[in-house]
């Protein structure tokens, strides 16, 4: 059976598949996917691996016309050096020669400078070329090589391996050498897979059921401690309670070199956040930090300095800290929009069970700002989701040069973040650069300004607008209000109506159903329209929603299905990359962003069209 | 950088108890192989009992089994040794010692290399 990583590589012109006979054959043969002889994997960026020989594809020079065979691998062999040139080209790196059927007098495959069919190569089964299953490093932990990645095949004993192993173990913990030949180098590390007793690994907190991993002589930089902790299905740790953060500074005492957790301001527009998603409401900075030099984006623990936070450049080399489990911050669901019939007072805008109002003109001092909205029967806004803050940003009124509180404050506990409406905090959207909490002056209260409704934390006592936000009292028969210019059923947002189609489709589908509703696949123009669709569907508990873009007419250009340029995106981390498929929001979490799916799969969807007795606006000229 | 700290010895009367401490300090327990070894006056240094770094999976010296046990706390980075029915016998200098992993596990690692080495902590048993 082909693991993931493996596969067969096939050329469509002939519909054979590369078979190693032996290490100075490689051929052709019909393909068979039980043949150990057809498998091969990326054993590095540029390495590909023969699974039955353990030895890589190379060549004796770059040069035209010679035979590819197979070579004990070595990472720094120019002749084992492969990238895939555009389309299904497989290419000797940094050179226009290719990998080759060969031809009727040549059965072993050669490198050419032909780019023909006979060049071009597909995984067997698929459309994508070799490079779409490509190579992952895999981060080690304890041992000796400091949290270096496998190296495989790696040489035991004289016998190679191109898998984490138990071998000379008698608990069967899997291990790799993190060098080709641990005979010599004596290098090894852990694998971060699932076996019996890996859990060993982790401390569990008693109270919380949470878990945490403290590699302490690891050397990485943080985006590879966060891909060590991701394949271990956790992530950097993230600390939002004040237990939390006492817990890990028992646990780390004992050492003194600083260890990566999840903190970063790696978002261009935002501030400061948690890799997990964890709203940032408690702070633990050392005295000084964050300092504000540019490219100090990430923030390591210091065991030494009494487990205080530091922000540091990401391309340090140090331990860091992993944490899986329990989080308390799922328990507190928030009802979909479509869930709960609101009902809001006059000049009262209704979503999801609550009702807000904008405050703008009458400016207050945060203390009084709350008074107000607790006459009113309700308080300063909480803000739970991303939802929720796209909701308030689209269709409040919410203004960009705005400056207004809202009901977060650190007034109880220093540091230590809370609404004022008692709700717990799950979600924070800072600015850049922020929460700065200036030590010169007391800055305990939040407010929401810029463009996009960050979050900046402010001194309690600045006249400024505010958001009040009450739950809606009328529970009676929800009116479905028809929207000028709209159908029933269709909401209006701007010039536009939309609909949520309910039947799972695939895209085809979902652009079909739209055009018979003389509507087409969502648009999205701007950041404005992205926040409405974002609180219009990103509640809800279905995972996806198709938006119009697809890659299905040129593979790497993303279109709409209507001639609309493509003049804003919303990508989800490590999207697009490089397979094609078509667009689909998603929900929850990671509400609103974009993820590349593929096409015949099914989800609901978004149908846009020209609300009734708009005039159209002139297309902007590029 | 590595640190060992023995803690806990004393002077005990024969059939007492005492609990013996280890505490590392300069990286985490689970990168090593602690052993806590002895040597009484004008003898050689013996292995008493070993923990491996990973899984804890425990070795002792046949004239210690069933008096002593060793444990381990990675949230402390301390590895302790209960000694209880202290015999006359067992009178030396207790050492701690932490050995880097390596990939091979037979299940002993009293006969590792050890490469750190605590200073040492003397244990009297005498009525």
């Known amino acids: 059976l082909l693991d993931t990583r493996q596969f067969l590589i096939y050329n469509e012109d002939h519909k054979r598949c590369v078979d190693a006979v032996s290490p100075s054959a490689v051929q052709t043969a019909a393909c068979n996917q039980d043949a150990e002889s057809q498998k091969f994997r990326w054993v590095s960026e540029s390495q590909i691996m023969s699974v039955a020989f353990k030895l890589c594809l190379g060549v004796p020079s770059k040069t035209d016309w010679v035979a590819i065979t197979l070579y004990a691998c070595d990472s720094k062999s120019e002749f084992q050096k492969w990238e895939c040139k555009n389309d299904t080209l497989l290419g000797i790196k940094g050179e226009d020669l290719f990998f080759n059927y060969g031809n009727r007098q040549e059965k072993n495959i050669m490198l050419y400078k032909g780019s023909g069919l006979w060049s071009r190569w597909k995984i067997y089964g698929t459309t994508d070329n070799l490079c779409s299953r490509g190579y992952e490093a895999m981060y080690t932990l304890l041992g000796n090589a400091n949290g270096a990645t496998c190296a495989f095949p790696f040489k035991f004993e004289n016998k190679w391996y191109a898998d984490c192993t138990s071998a000379g173990r008698s608990d069967g913990w899997l291990w790799c050498g993190t060098t080709t030949d641990y005979d010599t180098d004596k290098l090894f590390g852990y694998c971060p897979l699932k076996f019996e007793g890996s859990e060993s690994l982790w401390n569990k907190d008693p109270l919380t059921s949470v878990s945490y991993q403290i590699n302490s002589k690891s050397a990485l930089t943080w985006h590879q401690a966060r891909k060590s902790c991701q394949q271990q299905n956790a992530e950097l740790l993230s600390i939002t309670e004040i237990h939390e953060q006492t817990y890990l500074t028992g646990l780390t005492s004992s050492l003194t070199s600083g260890l990566w957790i999840g903190l970063n301001s790696l978002s261009f527009n935002s501030g400061w956040q948690w890799s997990d998603r964890s709203p940032f409401r408690y702070l633990n900075w050392l005295p000084g930090s964050p300092s504000a030099e540019p490219g100090k984006s990430c923030v390591s623990l210091n065991p030494g300095k009494n487990a205080k936070w530091e922000n540091l450049e990401c391309v340090q080399k140090l331990g860091y800290i992993c944490k899986k489990g329990n989080t308390t911050l799922n328990s507190f669901v928030i009802p979909s929009e479509s869930d709960v019939p609101t009902h809001c007072p006059s000049q009262w805008w209704p979503y999801a069970g609550h009702c807000y109002k904008i405050h703008r003109d009458e400016k207050k001092i945060q203390r009084d700002a709350l008074t107000t909205c607790r006459k009113e029967g309700g308080d300063l806004t909480s803000i739970h989701t991303i939802e929720e803050l796209d909701f308030i940003i689209s269709q409040l009124g919410y203004e960009p040069n705005d400056e207004l509180w809202i009901g977060l404050n650190d007034i109880k506990i220093q540091m230590y973040f809370e609404w004022s409406d008692g709700t717990p905090v799950t979600f924070t959207k800072w600015l850049r650069g922020e929460p700065s909490h200036e030590n010169n002056r007391q800055e305990d209260c939040v407010v929401m300004k810029g463009k996009d409704g960050y979050w900046a934390d402010r001194g309690c006592e600045w006249p400024l607008g505010y958001i009040c936000k009450m739950k809606s009292r009328s529970q009676g028969p929800e009116i479905v209000e028809v929207e000028k210019g709209c159908r029933k059923g269709w909401k209006k947002h701007h010039f536009y109506c939309y609909m949520i189609g309910h039947t799972l489709s695939t895209f085809a589908e979902a652009n079909q159903t739209c055009n018979n509703e003389n509507a087409y696949l969502t648009t999205i123009e701007d950041r404005y329209e992205q926040a409405f669709l974002t609180s219009f569907v990103g509640l809800r508990p279905e995972k996806y929603f198709w938006t119009g873009l697809s890659d299905i007419q040129t593979k790497g250009t993303f279109q709409w299905t209507i001639e609309e340029e493509v003049r804003f995106t919303h990508w989800n981390s490590d999207m697009p990359g490089r397979k094609p498929g078509c667009v689909a929001m998603r929900t929850g979490i990671a509400g609103g962003l974009w993820d590349v799916l593929k096409c015949d799969e099914k989800a609901k969807f978004v149908c846009k069209h020209w609300a009734e007795g708009v005039t159209h606006p002139p297309k902007p000229t590029t | 950088q590595v640190q060992l700290q023995e803690s806990g010895g004393g002077l005990v009367q024969p059939g007492e108890s005492l609990r013996l401490s280890c505490k590392l300090s300069g990286f985490t327990l689970d990168y090593y192989d602690i052993g806590w070894f002895r040597q009484a006056p004008g003898k050689e240094r013996e292995g008493v009992s070993c923990?491996?770094?990973?899984?804890?999976?425990?070795n002792y010296a046949d004239s210690v089994k069933g008096r002593f046990t060793i444990s381990r706390d990675n949230v402390k980075n301390t590895v302790y040794l209960q000694m209880n029915s202290l015999k006359p016998e067992d009178t030396a200098i207790y050492y701690c010692?932490?050995?880097?992993?390596?990939?091979?596990?037979?299940?002993?690692?009293?006969?590792?290399?050890?490469?750190?080495w605590g200073q040492g902590i003397q244990v009297t048993v005498s009525s």
């Open positions: 010692a932490a050995e880097a992993q390596t990939p091979y596990n037979d299940g002993d690692c009293t006969r590792a290399s050890y490469d750190y």
């Open positions: 923990i491996s770094s990973i899984g804890g999976s425990a």
